[in-house]
């Protein structure tokens, strides 16, 4: 069926970057400036996304692909395809509707985004605190107190290279 349709439908021959122009006898016309078609056989070209204001252009629009935006310094992307830019806060803070706010005692945020989270309660997982928490860092849990024999030294593990929230989707 698809093959039959493509033989009958001249628009199916129009490649990405063009559109099937009904006003010109269904000839494949190039997409006008600031528009694109990412698939073949399209009857219109889509308008290119414009990265304005707090958005900045990460990838220019071409005749076959939309522009991609990211955020200016001090902001980070939110949502699919960076649909929003959200203000960065400092580590040890969280973004509320009233702006950046310091984490309360007993909570931390090791990112420039996200919430202040309660320190991990090591004892709930049968462990002990190796390193105390701060506004910027969670506590580090170690072996249970019974596992630490006299004279045994406990070494603080290195901080992870990347924390949740910093990973690209």
């Amino acid at each position: 069926f698809e093959r039959t349709r493509s033989l009958q439908d001249p628009c199916s021959n129009c490649p990405a970057g063009t559109f099937c122009d009904n006003n010109r006898n269904q000839i494949c016309s190039p997409c006008p400036p600031n528009s694109f078609s990412s698939a073949g056989g399209q009857r219109t070209c889509d308008i290119c996304r414009q990265c304005k204001g707090v958005f900045r252009t990460r990838k220019e629009c071409s005749s076959t692909s939309n522009a991609e935006c990211d955020c200016t310094p001090g902001f980070h992307c939110l949502g699919a395809g960076c649909s929003m830019c959200e203000q960065d806060c400092k580590q040890g803070q969280e973004l509320t509707k009233k702006g950046c706010k310091d984490c309360c005692f007993g909570t931390f945020n090791d990112q420039k985004r996200g919430i202040c989270r309660p320190w991990t309660n090591c004892s709930l997982d049968g462990k002990s605190v190796l390193v105390n928490g701060t506004k910027e860092r969670d506590v580090v849990c170690g072996p249970s107190p019974a596992d630490l024999s006299p004279g045994a030294s406990s070494v603080t593990p290195p901080a992870p290279a990347r924390e949740p929230g910093h990973s690209p989707q």
Epitope: G79, K97, C104, I115, L124, D138, P164
Partner: antibody, heavy 120, light 106 residues
């Protein structure tokens, strides 16, 4: 694409423990906190806790403290939720859910759920 | 602990507008997220940060939040919108869900 695939249904006796797994694919597991939420038959959603897959740091709802343990194996891109001292009221569908990036903590992707039945 | 209150059920005729409320003390200062759950399926995020839609969610779904009430609005309701809807917030140390609202399309 982004997927969370959970282990199969379980039937347990009261007093026993159950361990449910949640395998993440389509994204870097270390990049996002993982949560566990349960739903008893005909009831609403009830949050149980989270794990930071990077550090292993956890936070549990007060109701479950002492009975729940959330762990992870980043090499297998899998999170686990173990619930001990099971009682009939723990019969529920247990979901893992990835924390999103919105202000104020949303859960943007969910596993298909694992039915745990506690019955003598 | 923080509590969220939702009406147990809301009924609406196809093509009309459904409004589902979520009440909580000064909820307007918090970020509210909404989930849709159809029978036998996992919840799906339909609104985050009060009023933003994830990709793939129709524009018919919108949200607002001020004072002590957040609202999920579904315009031009379709039979496929029949489901349970849950609001959710983060409150200092725990994730809190509303009790859920069953939306019936008449």
């Amino acid at each position: 694409q982004m997927q969370l695939v959970q282990s199969g249904a379980e039937v347990k006796k009261p007093g026993a423990s159950v361990k449910v797994s949640c395998k993440a694919s389509g994204y870097l597991m270390q990049g996002y906190y993982m949560h566990w939420v349960r739903q008893a038959p005909g009831q609403g959603l009830e949050w149980m806790g989270w794990i930071n897959p990077n550090s292993g740091g956890t936070n549990y709802a007060q109701k479950f403290q002492g009975r729940v343990t959330i762990t992870r194996d980043t090499s297998a891109s899998t999170a686990y939720m173990e619930l001990s001292s099971l009682r009939s009221e723990d019969t529920a569908v247990y979901y893992c859910a990835r924390e999103g990036e919105a202000v104020g903590l949303d859960l943007d992707y969910w596993g298909q759920g694992t039915l745990v039945t506690v019955s003598s | 602990s923080y509590e969220l209150t939702q009406p147990p059920s809301v009924s609406v005729a196809p093509g009309k507008t459904a409004r589902i409320t979520c009440g909580g003390n000064n909820i307007g200062s918090k970020s509210v997220h909404w989930y849709q759950q159809k029978p036998g399926q996992a919840p799906v995020l339909v609104i985050y940060y009060d009023s933003d839609r994830p990709s793939g969610i129709p524009e018919r779904f919108s949200g607002s939040n001020s004072g002590n009430t957040a609202t999920l609005t579904i315009s031009r309701v379709e039979a496929g919108d029949e489901a349970d809807y849950y609001c959710q917030v983060w409150d200092s140390s725990s994730v809190v869900f509303g009790g859920g609202t069953q939306l019936t399309v008449l």
